[in-house]
């Protein structure tokens, strides 16, 4: 059990396009055909204006036109829904496919890709039907851009909704050595295959990936929760042979100052194949990117039944230490360390300033006011809404 760990299956709430929780001022576009097809008319199931957002320029051959939604705070976006322009039956325009780009800070933009590297998402076949796309992997984003596509010069129009939940963990990025390959009777690929930061040689930094996607691995690390993926997919792993220090070092960056109660690390312990729980964990804390580490590190030795080969969540107490950056060293107790998920139990420290100062168009980073009114005190489930349950066989 991963206490405090979010469940992606429960993170499928409409984020406010259709019900107007997202204000017009947070919807923008690269261009609009006219004021009656401006970005604010891009709400799913809405018939405002001429019934959708339609860009001024052609989306063929260059795919440069986009519709942007600013969620104002980091969210995990698990699904998107699209429609064309209905306009009382008069509209004929829709987008057969599109791409997504997303950003957590308004500076770096990442192109969404599925687990096999495919960027293009199948869209609509008619102007009125809603097509839902399950995003696997989901994206942690504040800003989302839809780039409609066409295979010839034609008009395309779009109405959209985003589904997900507030990103309560506050994790902006983790830095880690690149995951490695274990050679058994078949190769087991223990890389972080959905990491969206930089990968420069042996280090991944500035992004999030499989260790923060809500998916916990199975007891047998060669098997996966996902269909049609390679052996080892759910885990990120490192070999003791590659780390003369005897530990794997990771750094975690958060949105603002937090008091950390615990870190939950979901680990594999299939020791017959070399995977072992860490022998111990040591974490250091600092409040700013250029500041020194504060105080003594928190050390936690892991006892318990290491003979039990089942995967499990290891809880590392963090003693309420206040920080925005954590650096944790995971000590090898066997040939391999295999993690599928890392999450944190923490509380935002009152009056702490946001991670990225200043502003970027069109809105400031994490405004200091209360969370949007459609979120409960848990900041997870919009009031009075049921999560979207995607129908079996619906197009993706």
């Amino acid at each position: 059990d991963m206490k405090g760990h979010f469940d992606p299956a429960k993170c499928r709430y409409a984020l406010g396009m259709q019900d107007r929780t997202i204000p017009d001022s947070d919807i923008s576009a690269s261009s609009s055909w006219s004021d009656s097809t401006a970005a604010r008319h891009s709400r799913l199931e809405s018939s405002d204006g001429d019934g959708a957002w339609c860009p001024a320029g052609s989306v063929f051959p260059k795919e440069e036109e986009y519709l942007q939604v600013d969620l104002q705070r980091l969210h995990l976006v698990a699904l998107v829904g699209t429609q064309g322009r209905h306009a009382g039956g008069l509209g004929k325009e829709f987008s057969r496919s599109y791409r997504l780009r997303y950003s957590r800070d308004g500076r770096r933009w990442m192109g969404w890709k599925d687990r096999w590297g495919q960027e293009v998402i199948s869209g609509n076949e008619d102007p009125e039907g809603v097509v839902l796309k399950d995003l696997g992997p989901p994206m942690v984003a504040r800003l989302v851009r839809f780039y409609p596509r066409a295979d010839r010069v034609m008009s395309v129009c779009l109405r959209v909704e985003l589904y997900g939940c507030l990103w309560r963990d506050g994790l902006l990025s983790y830095t880690a050595p690149v995951g490695q390959t274990m050679y058994l009777s078949e190769a087991v690929y223990l890389n972080d295959s959905t990491y969206d930061g930089h990968t420069v040689g042996g280090l991944q930094y500035g992004g999030l990936g499989q260790l923060a996607d809500g998916v916990v691995g199975l007891d047998d690390f060669r098997k996966s929760q996902e269909l049609r993926v390679w052996p080892g997919y759910d885990y990120v792993g490192w070999s003791n042979h590659s780390f003369s220090s005897g530990y794997v070092e990771m750094e975690f960056e958060f949105d603002r100052l937090r008091a950390f109660q615990a870190m939950q690390v979901h680990c594999n312990n299939m020791h017959t194949l070399g995977a072992r729980l860490p022998g111990g964990v040591e974490c250091r804390f600092r409040r700013g990117p250029a500041m020194a580490w504060e105080g003594e590190p928190m050390r936690h030795n892991l006892g318990g039944n290491l003979g039990d080969p089942r995967a499990r969540a290891v809880s590392v107490p963090l003693g309420g230490r206040v920080a925005r950056f954590l650096q944790c060293r995971f000590l090898f107790a066997g040939p391999w360390l295999l993690f599928s998920e890392i999450s944190f139990i923490s509380d935002v420290v009152n009056n702490s300033s946001p991670a990225l100062g200043g502003t970027f168009p069109p809105a400031p980073w994490w405004p200091p006011g209360p969370p949007p009114t459609n979120f409960s005190s848990l900041e997870l489930e919009p009031r009075g809404q049921q999560p979207v349950a995607k129908a079996e066989g619906s197009p993706t």
């Epitope: 770096r108 420069v200 250029a290």
Partner: antibody
């Protein structure tokens, strides 16, 4: 304020080694990588390699067999060593820092003053 | 490795001109592109990061744009102190690579 100061020889004999030290001040290594880049009239700017605060290194494959980057974080020093220099390694060698955190993510924002190296007998 | 093809190599300019430099990546680099200015005898200075974000203290006459493989760097009203060499660099993956540079010279 942030500074990267380089020290090293200006002249190296062919087949000998080049050693440059980059001493940093005004920031802690944690959350940064120190990159090495060289510039020659013939080849422009070439990225050579990087060392991150955790000691992990990455080298340009074209130089991996003769390049070594290490650090002494307690002294704020990064050590660059390239072996078997030839005349075409004549260049200005720079160290530069790059953040690994989202909040301070600006590409290579501070550079050393450069070390002009001539390989000649 | 990713090749960054920068054009033109030289630009003859007068004060007040608008200057555009382009950089084309041999494969997609998202928006992980930086632009640097280098004056004779000096180290490169960061101007633009993530394709379009001006670094602290950089005048707003310097702008950048692009995503994927095509990137543009513009100086809206060239001033005498802008005479320098400008480089693009991809920060997307190892090995990091630079464009060959564009030298701005006075007409």
């Amino acid at each position: 304020q942030v500074q990267l100061k380089q020290s090293g020889p200006g002249l190296v004999q062919p087949s000998q080694s080049l050693s440059i030290t980059c001493t940093v001040s005004g920031f802690s290594f944690t959350g940064y990588g120190i990159h090495w880049v060289r510039q020659s009239p013939g080849k422009g700017l070439e990225w050579l390699g990087v060392i991150w605060s955790g000691g992990i290194t990455d080298y340009n494959a074209a130089f991996i067999s003769r390049l070594s980057i290490s650090m002494d974080s307690s002294k704020g020093q990064v050590f660059f060593k390239m072996n078997s220099l030839q005349a075409n390694d004549t260049a200005i060698y720079y160290c530069a820092r790059r953040s690994t955190t989202v909040v301070a993510d600006y590409a290579m924002d501070y550079w050393g003053q450069g070390t002009s190296v001539t390989v000649s007998s | 490795s990713i090749v960054m093809t920068q054009t033109p190599k030289f630009l003859l300019v007068s004060a007040g001109d608008r200057v555009t430099i382009t950089c084309k990546a041999s494969q997609s680099v998202s928006n992980d592109v930086a632009w640097y200015q280098q004056k004779p005898g000096q180290s490169p200075k960061l101007l633009i990061y993530y394709a379009s974000n001006r670094y602290t203290g950089v005048p707003d006459r310097f702008t950048g744009s692009g995503y994927g493989t095509d990137f543009t760097f513009t100086i809206n009203t060239v001033q005498a102190e802008d005479l320098a060499v400008y480089f693009c660099q991809q920060d997307y993956t190892s090995p990091l690579t630079f464009g060959a540079g564009t030298k701005l010279e006075l007409k």
